[in-house]
Interface confidence: low
């Protein structure tokens, strides 16, 4: 599923991401835009053999199990395939664990490079939330 900007903002808000660990909703929508272009089915292979999955591009080395990443820790205790669902519950729940891990949203390279320090509120402007 490819979400609309405001559609995703509403879904993320419903799942409790607004101001989760101090990060406003705009941060999460911005991260999703530059990680996956709002596509729940996005996958990208990394040079270390791991793969990033879903709308928030969650990595199989640490967070989920895809049966194909040597040394996977699966800290979210989920199959990576769950992160590709049009239902973002699994991605959101895992993202909450990631953002609580110490580095906050710096864990997402796209957020660090494209969203951090910018007017992230622009990503939810005009949305009926």
């Amino acid at each position: 599923k490819v979400f609309g900007r405001c559609e995703l903002a509403a879904a993320m808000k419903r799942h409790g991401l607004d101001n989760y660990r101090g990060y406003s909703l705009g941060n999460w929508v911005c991260a999703a835009k530059f990680e996956s272009n709002f596509n729940t089915q996005a996958t990208n292979r990394n040079t270390d053999g791991s793969t990033d999955y879903g709308i928030l591009q969650i990595n199989s080395r640490w967070w989920c199990n895809d049966g194909r990443t040597p040394g996977s820790r699966n800290l979210c205790n989920i199959p990576c395939s769950a992160l590709l669902s049009s239902d973002i519950t699994a991605s959101v729940n895992c993202a909450k664990k990631i953002v609580s891990d110490g580095n906050g949203m710096n864990a997402w390279v796209a957020w660090r490079n494209r969203c951090k320090g910018t007017d992230v509120q622009a990503w939810i402007r005009g949305c009926r939330l």
């Epitope: 089915q41 996005a42 053999g49 194909r68 040597p70 040394g71 395939s81 590709l84």
Partner: antibody, heavy 115, light 107 residues
Framework: QVQLQESGAEVMKPGASVKISCKAT????????IEWVKQRPGHGLEWIGE????????YYNEKFKGKATFTADTSSNTAYMQLSSLTSEDSAVYYC?????????WGQGTTLTVS | DIELTQSPATLSVTPGDSVSLSCRAS??????LHWYQQKPHESPRLLIK???QSMSGIPSRFSGSGSGTDFTLSINSVETEDFGMYFC?????????FGGGTKLEIK
């Protein structure tokens, strides 16, 4: 139950192209990798590459880049592999399999003869 | 690419014998090694995943062991239905590679 049904045997002329299909049933097609494997007598099993149908992401064995092209149709739960510029070296049995690092489910194989 | 070398190429046994098939990797692959059985004109069948995890429906006489570069598939008291080809496969890195196979045949 999980099943992978491949298309039937093909006899092709050198230089032609062929498209082999693999219809998946019994699981969520979009979220598992489909692998393609070549088997020739005396050459064992060779991994050609893989496609994740939901995203269209593909990864190829360098040896088969330019030879094989993977596509998938999520409306029919079918993966395809096209082989181009066929030569006698392409004569083989081609398998699709569901990929989880290991391959627990396989198609029955498609025999390709190039002559 | 990681090379997998299987030995012996052919193993002639009598039903009831116990046998060991070897798979050696050109570099360490941790436990990311899987075993398949293939009968003539059939697709491969996964027997053991991740070195030692038996698949459901596979007889308990099949077991796997090893780590790093040396792996073994053991068949305790071979039965006539066990004859065929056996392949190992690694999932430690891309491209995925298979061993050349061991043919288990009746003596």
């Amino acid at each position: 139950q999980v099943q992978l049904q491949e298309s039937g045997a093909e006899v092709m002329k050198p230089g032609a192209s062929v498209k082999i299909s693999c219809k998946a049933t019994g699981y969520t097609f979009t979220t598992y990798w489909i692998e393609w494997v070549k088997q020739r007598p005396g050459h064992g099993l060779e991994w050609i590459g893989e496609i994740l149908p939901g995203s269209g992401s593909t990864y190829y064995n360098e040896k088969f880049k330019g030879k094989a092209t993977f596509t998938a149709d999520t409306s029919s739960n079918t993966a395809y592999m096209q082989l181009s510029s066929l030569t006698s070296e392409d004569s083989a049995v081609y398998y699709c399999a569901r990929g989880d690092g290991h391959y627990g489910y396989w198609g029955q194989g498609t025999t390709l003869t190039v002559s | 690419d990681i090379e997998l070398t299987q030995s012996p190429a052919t193993l002639s046994v009598t039903p009831g014998d116990s046998v060991s098939l070897s798979c050696r990797a050109s570099q360490s692959i941790s436990n990311n090694l899987h075993w398949y059985q293939q009968k003539p004109h059939e697709s491969p069948r996964l027997l053991i995943k991740y070195t030692s995890q038996s698949m459901s429906g596979i007889p308990s006489r099949f077991s796997g062991s090893g780590s790093g570069t040396d792996f073994t598939l053991s068949i305790n008291s071979v039965e006539t239905e066990d004859f065929g080809m056996y392949f190992c496969q690694q999932s430690n890195s891309w491209p995925r590679t298979f061993g050349g196979g061991t043919k288990l045949e009746i003596k």
